[in-house]
């Protein structure tokens, strides 16, 4: 189908000739307190990368899904054939019925005992989650601090290997930068040593301490 | 036409065990039930396995089941009967033979020239 | 088991004879029966099905009939080539079920 916005639409428009603000506009910034440090990430890139993750994580769902669709698909195609009833006549036939009838008794004995399993589990899944809660009120939960999460760290949980390739290289890029700035912290400690000890202050600063 | 051959027969001792085969052509195999009927020295026709178009289900009287098998395979259109514990009253003549239906009523339609299987010690 | 019994083992009648053999069945079968020819050389055919339809290819001098538990086939007009062994059978329940045969011989 084709679209109907012209092209001009949506070609960028030019940006308006900057408006001259009177100095009183400007004073108000400087008394403002300052910002607080800005993040490395602008709101509109934290919105689409949460957009991107939600994406991702309604295709795993759907996925997941499809699976389970699958997955059912072939148990019911395994346990239930086909029925061929070409040259079968009324005699095979009424037979046929007393091997399905045996087969759904078969099938009810185990549905009976698979209920009978899960009934117990819940039954214990119940009483383990009340000891739980009783433990619980014997200790002081302690206040849980709100961690930011970072991107990466995001995606990482999200994608899980898929990720990894992409996240290591960006994560080895920050590890050098992180090398060379503990680097450069060491050379300039060792520099201010050198000066202390030239004009005699590593001394006076012991018999200071002292 | 439709025609069935078997082979597969021969002689053995009790105990024993036996594949028997037998070739269709002229029909689309794949579309009918078939069956073997066997007869005996004395001359009595006995049914003793059916088996449906896609192999899903078989039929055996009690005096085979557990020891025959029947079975297909619609890519060669050949039907096959395992026969294993083989014993001296299975001696008999085994035709291979077509199964229709009208309303509900069951028959075999074409017959093979059959294939002997003798059991003796 | 359903049993199945034919009054007489062995025929005789002459060319051009009207023979009819008979059939019974040690319960209902409700019309589920058939009817096969064996020749001397051991082919086996099928003649009639569900008590009274002929098979294709088959001559029209046979005919059956019959209902509940009692049944027969009808050869009109006796040919050479009819010389043969005929056996019932029912369809009615499971196993398949066939008489001994009656054996058809020329006066």
């Known amino acids: 189908m084709a679209d109907g916005s012209s092209d001009a639409a949506r070609e960028p428009r030019p940006a308006p000739a900057p408006i001259r603000r009177r100095s009183s506009n400007y004073r108000a910034y400087a008394t403002e307190p300052h910002a607080k440090k800005k993040s490395k990430i602008s709101a509109s890139r934290k919105l689409q990368l949460k957009t991107l993750l939600l994406q991702i994580a309604k295709q795993e769902l759907e996925r997941e899904a499809e699976e389970r669709r699958g997955e059912k698909g072939r148990a019911l195609s395994t346990r239930c054939q086909p029925l061929e009833l070409a040259g079968l006549g009324f005699a095979e036939l009424q037979d046929l019925c007393r091997q399905l009838h045996a087969r759904v008794d078969k099938v009810d004995e185990e549905r009976y005992d698979i209920e009978a399993k899960v009934t117990k589990n819940i039954t214990e899944i119940a009483d383990l989650t009340q000891k739980i809660f009783d433990l619980r009120g014997k200790f002081k939960r302690p206040t849980l601090r709100r961690v930011r999460i970072s991107a990466d760290a995001m995606m990482q949980a999200l994608l899980g290997a898929r990720a990894k390739e992409s996240l290591d290289l960006r994560a080895h890029l920050k590890q050098v930068k992180k090398e060379d700035t503990e680097k450069e912290n060491r050379e300039v400690g060792d520099w201010r040593k050198n000066i202390d000890a030239l004009s005699g202050m590593e001394g006076r600063k012991k018999k200071f301490e002292s | 036409e439709v025609q069935m051959v078997e082979s597969g027969g021969g002689l053995l001792k009790p105990g024993g065990s036996l594949k028997l085969s037998c070739a269709a052509s002229g029909f689309t195999y794949s579309n009918y039930a078939m069956s073997w009927v066997r007869q005996t020295p004395e001359k009595r026709l006995e049914w003793v396995a059916t088996i449906s178009s896609g192999g899903s289900y078989s039929y055996y009287p009690d005096s085979v089941k557990g020891r025959f098998t029947i079975s297909r395979d619609n890519a060669k259109n050949t039907l096959y009967l395992q026969m294993l514990s083989l014993r001296s009253e299975d001696t008999a003549m085994y035709y291979c033979?077509?199964?229709?239906?009208?309303?509900?009523?069951?028959?075999?339609?074409?017959w093979g020239q059959g294939s002997s299987v003798t059991v003796s010690s | 088991d359903i049993q199945m019994t034919q009054t007489s083992s062995s025929l005789s009648a002459s060319l051009g004879d009207r023979v009819t053999i008979s059939c019974r069945a040690s319960q209902e079968i409700t019309n589920y029966l058939n009817w096969y020819q064996q020749k001397p050389d051991g082919t086996i055919k099928l003649l009639i099905y569900?008590?009274?339809r002929i098979h294709s290819g088959v001559s029209s001098r046979f005919s059956g009939s019959g209902s509940g538990t009692d049944y027969s086939l009808t050869i009109s007009n006796l040919e050479q080539e009819d010389i043969a062994t005929y056996f019932c059978q029912q369809g009615n329940t499971l196993p398949l079920t066939f008489d001994t045969g009656t054996k058809l011989e020329l006066k």
């Open positions: 033979a077509r199964r229709d239906n009208y309303y509900g009523s069951t028959f075999m339609d074409y």
């Open positions: 569900y008590t009274s």
